[in-house]
């Protein structure tokens, strides 16, 4: 039970375009220390939607203060939906390397569906 | 304090539109914080979470009531609704809204409405 | 879906007396355990978060334990106003479910 899991509570999500999707996901220990990152879809193939280390989403917010000391929240909101964004969202916790940080767990993701802009 | 109400008809008939209304007063329900969520309970029995939304309009429903449920949000009221479709004489139940922690540990309902008997007959 | 156990279903104790109520998990759900008290026409209240933590306001004869499958709540001095309903929530993974309720009477 000590283990870090990673909770990604919502199986599924429903975000008319336009608007806002909000992806939970949290921690249950602060060990061991390294970035979360979030992809779409799983496997070789998957994107990269967020990086808690490096890099510019500019669609993508954290829904509380990543450097917060403590902080287990690693909740995201992605802006401005579009059909193109369905899929199966992962949170994924990876560990700190040299040189490269390993994945440690991952969520068991969030189905994103976009419903048409409401009329 | 945040205080929330439930609203709407007491009464459907077999096959119509469940209608509810959540108005939350004493703060806002755009807080990134929160989401907001609906519960039911059948008379005598026990809580069944039917779904929640997030203020930017971010959905999640209960898989076993989903084909039949809308929830929606409207910020400039500070209200957020619910719609079951298609109802039976199992939908009769007291009807919550509650708000919901939005962050771990844990996602509690926290606050809650005092609920709403909605009888489906004819 | 993860399914919550309660047991008992219903018991009787006398005011005073030391409660204690279970509520077991299909599966592992880390700390992520709530629990309500509902007295009859009134909406739940949050008496425990995260399988342990005492909601603001509510008095510390009410305690939490347990993660991963099992958990209990505790009410070390049974008073009058503890007479309920309560229930425990698991708010792992959606949908989030409910134990079936425990009814504390009065002996």
């Known amino acids: 039970e000590d283990e870090l899991q990673v909770i990604q509570p919502e199986k599924s999500v429903s975000v008319a375009a336009g608007e806002s999707a909000t992806l939970r996901c949290a921690m249950t220990s602060l060990i061991p220390v390294g970035p979360i990152m979030w992809f779409r879809g799983a496997g070789a193939g998957r994107e990269l939607i967020y990086n808690q280390k490096e890099g510019h989403f500019p669609r993508v917010t954290t829904v509380s203060e990543l450097t917060k000391r403590n902080n287990l929240d690693f909740s995201i909101s992605i802006s401005n939906i579009t059909p193109a964004d369905a899929g199966t969202y992962y949170c994924v916790k990876f560990r700190k390397g040299s040189p490269d940080d390993v994945e440690f767990k991952s969520g068991a993701g969030t189905e994103l569906s976009v419903r048409a802009k409401p009329s | 304090q945040l205080q929330l109400q439930e609203s709407g008809p007491g009464l459907v008939k077999p096959s119509e539109t469940l209608s509810l209304t959540c108005t939350v007063s004493g703060g806002s329900i755009s807080s990134n914080s929160y989401y907001w969520g609906w519960i039911r309970q059948p008379p005598g029995k026990g809580l069944e979470w039917i779904g929640s939304i997030y203020y930017s309009g971010s959905t999640y429903y209960n898989p076993s009531l989903k084909s039949r449920v809308t929830i929606s949000v409207d910020t400039s009221k500070n209200q957020f609704s619910l719609k079951l479709s298609s109802v039976t004489a199992a939908d009769t139940a007291v009807y919550y809204c509650?708000?919901?922690?939005?962050?771990?540990?844990?996602?509690?309902?926290?606050?809650w409405g005092q609920g709403t008997m909605v009888t489906v007959s004819s | 879906d993860i399914q919550m156990t309660q047991s008992p279903s219903s018991l009787s104790a006398s005011v005073g007396d030391r409660v204690t109520i279970t509520c077991r998990a299909s599966?592992?759900?880390?700390?992520?355990l709530n629990w309500y008290q509902q007295k009859p026409g009134k909406a739940p209240k949050l008496l425990i978060y995260a399988a342990s933590s005492l909601q603001s306001g509510v008095p510390s004869r009410f305690s939490g334990s347990g993660s991963g499958t099992d958990f209990t709540l505790t009410i070390s001095s049974l008073q009058p106003e503890d007479f309920a309903t309560y229930y425990c929530q698991q708010a792992y993974s959606h949908p989030f479910t409910f134990g079936g309720g425990t009814k504390v009477e009065i002996k």
């Open positions: 509650a708000r919901e922690v939005g962050a771990p540990p844990s996602y509690p309902f926290d606050i």
């Open positions: 599966q592992s759900i880390s700390s992520y």
